[in-house]
Interface confidence: low
């Protein structure tokens, strides 16, 4: 399996990964919204998807990965696996992954998944904008 880098990737590599992730994320979110109409966003789920200690903000892969591993059995496994593969490339070796529990209640679970997908898409937009506004 892919070994996480021990150093920060160059911006050009990060940009390629973000470009790979954006359509995957958007497609997953749109498919889920079509399939699960009327499911509200959960205000108790917070994806800490950006690092607060770097400028421009960096995608916090170690914080995001556990959520996608958690929702993998409950969503489109093929797309989720592609997202995990890309996020793995961004993950630093020394960064621990936290454990994530999916709500047991079906409705809460759907709301949880929707929120993760929405927040992840928003994060990708934010990182992509900051990468494009910085030096190429």
């Amino acid at each position: 399996s892919h070994m996480a880098p021990t150093h920060q990737l160059p911006p050009s590599d990060v940009r390629k990964i973000i470009l790979e992730l954006q359509p995957l994320s958007r497609g997953l979110l749109e498919d889920y919204q079509k399939k699960e109409t009327g499911v509200p966003e959960s205000n108790r789920t917070l994806l800490l998807c950006l690092t607060s200690d770097s400028q421009p903000p960096r995608l916090n892969s170690s914080a995001i990965l556990p959520y996608f591993r958690a929702i993998r059995p409950l969503s489109d496994k093929n797309i989720i696996d592609k997202i995990i593969e890309q996020l793995d490339k961004l993950k630093f070796q020394h960064e621990p992954e936290t454990e994530i529990s999916v709500p047991a209640d079906t409705f809460e679970c759907k709301s949880f998944i929707l929120t993760i997908l929405q927040q992840f898409s928003a994060c990708l937009e934010s990182v992509f904008k900051s990468l494009n506004s910085g030096p190429q």
Epitope: N43, R44, L48, P96, T98, E99
Partner: antibody, heavy 118, light 111 residues
């Protein structure tokens, strides 16, 4: 109904040890992070320790790190706080608290009193 | 660590009056547009109870007269119309980063 019942509080001499327990019921214990928060007599609240739902991750403030250890036994629905090298300033009511999400403490037990005095 | 400065330390108001308590953090406690600030009520001889989580979300079962707002470093907690059962100490708490820290509390009394 969510219930958190603490026990193990006692009078102990400075330098002594104590183990607090918290038995949880009314929810799936293994799905939730848990914390200990304390309150010295007549004072405010102070966060003591947090443990992730599976027990892999633990967090402490600097003044407690190395002296206290938070742990859990999901099979027994029980949270623990092992307290070593106790000081007079550790005298407080210790509350067991359930976590929701990664950051919110939503249910509190009634507390167990720890008194450190010679 | 993030220091939480809560004010006022105590408050004595009449029934049905509006109550406002503020909490100022020494640095931003917001993340991705969400204020990681929570408010608790502690009645005499009881354990604290969560009222508001993540700045403005009302905890289930909590009366709608309680509300919260704010972002960044400045947050406020409001009781729209004070009731006798609201006599308690109120605490703010941040969970933006470890160590989690609380405000020193506001003691609320009825005149």
């Amino acid at each position: 109904e969510v219930q958190l019942v603490e026990s193990g509080g006692d009078l102990v001499k400075p330098g002594g040890s104590l183990r607090l327990s918290c038995v949880a019921s009314g929810f799936t214990f293994s799905n939730y992070g848990m914390s200990w928060v304390r309150q010295a007599p007549g004072k405010g609240l102070q966060w003591v320790a947090t443990i992730s739902y599976g027990g892999s991750y633990t967090y402490y403030p600097d003044n407690i790190k190395g002296r206290f250890t938070i742990s859990r036994d999901n099979a027994k629905n029980t949270l623990y706080l092992q307290m070593n090298s106790l000081r007079a300033e550790d005298t407080a009511m210790y509350y067991c608290v359930r976590g929701y999400g990664y950051d919110t403490m939503d249910y509190w037990g009634q507390g167990t009193l720890v008194t450190v005095s010679s | 660590e993030i220091v939480m400065t809560q004010s006022p330390a105590s408050l004595s108001l009449s029934q049905e009056e509006k109550v406002t308590i503020t909490c100022k953090a020494s640095q931003s406690v917001s993340f991705a547009g969400t204020g990681l600030m929570h408010w608790y009520q502690q009645k005499p001889g009881q354990a604290p109870k969560l009222l508001i989580y993540r700045a403005s979300n009302l905890e289930a079962g909590v009366p709608s007269r309680f509300s919260g707002s704010g972002s960044g470093t400045d947050f406020s907690f409001t009781i729209s119309s004070l009731e006798p059962e609201d006599v308690a100490v109120y605490y703010c708490q941040q969970s933006r980063e470890y160590p989690w820290t609380f405000g020193q509390g506001t003691k609320l009394e009825i005149k």
